[in-house]
């Protein structure tokens, strides 16, 4: 099966790599803008030259192109924690990221949140925290996992989870309990 | 008591509008973002829009962008979307949340409201 082209990467497959069809003489095939550019005007004939223009503060093009405007350039999301790792040039749009000791968390595919990594309080460090993953946590005897957080077995109710992992302590407990009502 | 109660979902014909409120009470409410989100039938979870605390900041998912708008109220305590050119696709429940500030996860949920597009 051939994949379906959009009428655009047609147009573009009739010229040789770097090149674009001209979109009123499709006899005519146009060298692309380089990255940091954009197109003003189309070459005017065979072996002319395109009219690229340099992009405007606040927009980038990363890649050869013959796109009408450039891109306006990402910017970091303060309300969710990211700065800027490196703000935007003509060819390259900004780059977000994390604080130190903190990691991602992608609420979808274009959309990250900044936290802070769990320090295994209570536990040890089972695998270290990564850009886009929280620490993974080993807890000590006598505390369970909760939400990547080590908590005393002492919070663990008989329903959750837990009581496979804190049952010696669940036990004395009941042991307890029962030894007082003799 | 903790409450987020969202009303104004319902049925619309493709291209309407509709505008979504979700009235918080039982928390500051204007400490931290808030969100919508939505569950297709059968679908998961899709972020759909947040506000930060001032209402200065706003998010939207590319496939509502243009269309829906975020605000909010904070002397009402309400949180607000504005969805116009409604879509078959945007037939979801829609829920509003206070995501927590320390992990993810949600600190509140509302029960949600049912928006259908539909001719």
């Known amino acids: 099966l051939v994949p379906h082209l959009g009428d655009r990467e047609k147009r573009d497959s009739v010229c040789p790599q770097g090149k674009y069809i001209h979109p009123q003489n499709n006899s005519i095939c146009c060298t692309k803008c380089h990255k940091g550019t954009y197109l003003y005007n189309d070459c005017p004939g065979p072996g002319q030259d395109t009219d690229c223009r340099e992009c405007e503060s606040g927009s980038f093009t990363a890649s050869e192109n013959h796109l009408r405007h450039c891109l306006s350039c990402s910017k970091c999301r303060k309300e969710m924690g990211q700065v800027e790792i490196s703000s935007c040039t003509v060819d390259r749009d900004t780059v977000c990221g994390c604080r130190k000791n903190q990691y991602r968390h992608y609420w979808s595919e274009n959309l990250f949140q900044c936290f802070n990594c769990s320090l295994c309080l209570n536990g040890t460090v089972h695998l270290s925290c990564q850009e886009k993953q929280n620490t993974v946590c080993t807890c000590h005897a006598g505390f369970f996992l909760r939400e990547n957080e080590c908590v005393s077995c002492s919070n663990c109710k008989k329903s959750l989870e837990c009581t496979k992992l804190c049952l010696p302590q669940i036990e004395n407990v009941k042991g307890t309990e029962d030894s007082g009502t003799t | 008591e903790v409450q987020l109660l969202e009303s104004g979902g319902g049925l619309v014909q493709p291209g309407g509008s509709l505008r979504l409120s979700c009235a918080a009470s039982?928390?500051?409410?204007?400490?931290?973002?808030m969100v919508w989100v939505r569950q297709a039938p059968g679908k998961g979870l899709e972020w759909v829009s947040h506000i930060d605390e001032y209402g200065t900041n706003t998010y939207y998912a590319d496939s509502v962008k243009g269309r829906f708008t975020i605000s909010r109220d904070n002397s009402k305590n309400t949180l607000y979307l504005q969805m116009n050119s409604l879509r078959a696709e945007d037939t979801a429940v829609y829920y509003c949340?206070?995501?927590?500030?320390?992990?993810?996860?949600?600190?509140?949920w509302g029960q949600g409201t049912l928006v259908t597009v539909s001719s």
């Open positions: 949340a206070k995501p927590r500030n320390d992990r993810p996860g949600f600190d509140y």
């Open positions: 039982g928390f500051t409410f204007g400490n931290g973002n």
